[in-house]
């Protein structure tokens, strides 16, 4: 495990190759989750922020930026989009949670909740994923598309198998997250593929 506190993955160029694989021993399907991370990009086009595919299932869990001020969450190939007024370009702290029992998905941008949306009520997100930063997977761990690649910096990434209450989302935004049990930036297993550099986080 690597403690990446105070560091970021830098994706310095548009490509169809550069990415980071995040490794988790997740063994059971997800009924709930919360994912939080920081990102900084000056791309105005669409791009993938967090791509989670399972064997034979594309877009099992995908966080995708459609354009400035629009964030999408895919669960089991279904999509909801939430809108926010934001500065561009600017660093952003993103959290998104989803609860199977209600289907409710909620984005939090810089500690502020966006309008709740609903999708895939009763669905379970499959386990044993391939998780990729920097590219959007169209297969299990591959089939990338340059036009959806991420250029910029990502850090402070945590993922829990529960829907965090607002006070814990705010703690993550403020830099004091709870220990995370799917992915934890302080104890991360990862593989860098291509031109991705680890650098100090300087924009928070």
């Amino acid at each position: 495990h690597t403690d990446l506190s105070g560091k970021v993955f830098v994706f310095p160029r548009e490509s169809v190759t550069d990415h980071v694989n995040l490794i988790t021993p997740l063994e059971k399907p997800l009924q709930n989750f919360t994912l939080c991370f920081r990102a900084y990009s000056d791309l105005s086009r669409a791009y993938s922020l967090f791509s989670y595919n399972t064997q034979g299932r594309d877009n099992e869990l995908l966080v995708y930026k459609e354009r400035v001020g629009e964030y999408s969450l895919y669960i089991g190939r279904h999509k909801v989009t939430s809108k926010v007024i934001e500065k561009f370009p600017a660093p952003v702290h993103i959290c998104v949670s989803w609860e199977s029992s209600s289907g409710i998905a909620e984005f939090w941008i810089n500690g502020t909740p966006l309008v709740k949306k609903g999708l895939r009520q009763g669905y379970f997100v499959e386990a044993q994923p391939k998780i990729v930063l920097g590219q959007e997977q169209d297969s299990y761990g591959g089939k990338f598309d340059r036009s959806q690649s991420f250029v910029g910096e990502i850090g402070d990434l945590y993922m829990w198998d529960s829907v965090l209450p607002p006070e814990n989302i705010l703690s993550a935004y403020q830099g004091t997250p709870l220990p995370a049990n799917i992915l934890d930036w302080q104890a991360l297993n990862y593989e860098i593929r291509g031109y991705v550099i680890i650098k100090p986080l300087v924009w928070v």
């Epitope: 198998d161 709870l178 220990p179 302080q186």
Partner: antibody
Framework: QVQLVQSGAEVKKPGSSVKVSCKAS????????MHWVRQAPGQGLEWIGM????????NYNEKFKSRATLTVDKSTSTAYMELSSLRSEDTAVYYC????????????WGQGTLVTVSS | DIQMTQSPSSLSASVGDRVTITCKAS??????VAWYQQKPGKAPKLLIY???YRYSGVPSRFSGSGSGTDFTLTISSLQPEDFATYYC?????????FGQGTKLEIK
């Protein structure tokens, strides 16, 4: 095999400090968080804090933040826990323990170091 | 801090008995609970993590269940080597906290 070997028992005076060592072997020392836990005689377990040997990032239980200092020596794969301003209530067995592969649980423990605080 | 309250604090049982130890958290800890076994003069040993996953090498007679605030450790058929003290631990919030322990004695 993976093991943590701690320093021997210590007897200390109230107000003094103690430094307990924990030497790791059988795994990559710099890849796992090291935790410190104590157990007073006949009592339960109490988490003191943790340190990552590579980044030297630490996280302390607020109760110990002002008195405990966690450090590492990467060259010898050794973790240290220093506790200052000792009082009789600090009499306990102090354990180092490695973070589990899966999550924030402790899968490998040192044998423990008894620290006795007595005037 | 999250309090972890174990019950009973001690119990007597015989070899072959089925034993259940419970742990109640003072607030929701999801499934982020582990169980440890400790014998006198020895360090604790990890038995169960994430509420219900048996750690490698742990006999199948040990099982864990629960989520939220209520957790259970069950030993399906007590063996002589199982007489020890058992602790639960939450890893949902800092600081990590432990139950006060349950001492399992021979009847």
């Amino acid at each position: 095999q993976v093991q943590l070997v701690q320093s021997g028992a210590e007897v200390k005076k109230p107000g003094s400090s103690v430094k307990v060592s924990c030497k790791a072997s059988g795994y990559t020392f710099t890849s796992y968080w090291m935790h410190w836990v104590r157990q007073a005689p006949g009592q339960g377990l109490e988490w003191i804090g943790m340190i990552h040997p590579n980044s030297v990032n630490t996280n302390y239980n607020e109760k110990f933040k002002s008195r405990a200092t966690l450090t590492v020596d990467k060259s010898t794969s050794t973790a240290y826990m220093e506790l200052s301003s000792l009082r009789s209530e600090d009499t306990a067995v102090y354990y180092c323990a490695r973070r589990n592969d899966y999550y924030w649980y402790f899968d490998v423990w040192g044998q423990g170091t008894l620290v006795t605080v007595s005037s | 801090d999250i309090q972890m309250t174990q019950s009973p604090s001690s119990l007597s049982a015989s070899v072959g008995d089925r034993v259940t130890i419970t742990c109640k958290a003072s607030q929701n800890v999801n499934s982020n609970v582990a169980w440890y076994q400790q014998k006198p003069g020895k360090a604790p040993k990890l038995l169960i993590y994430s509420a219900s996953y048996r750690y490698s090498g742990v006999p199948s007679r040990f099982s864990g269940s629960g989520s939220g605030t209520d957790f259970t450790l069950t030993i399906s058929s007590l063996q002589p080597e199982d007489f020890a003290t058992y602790y639960c631990q939450q890893a949902n919030n800092y600081p990590f906290t432990f139950g006060q322990g349950t001492k399992l004695e021979i009847k």
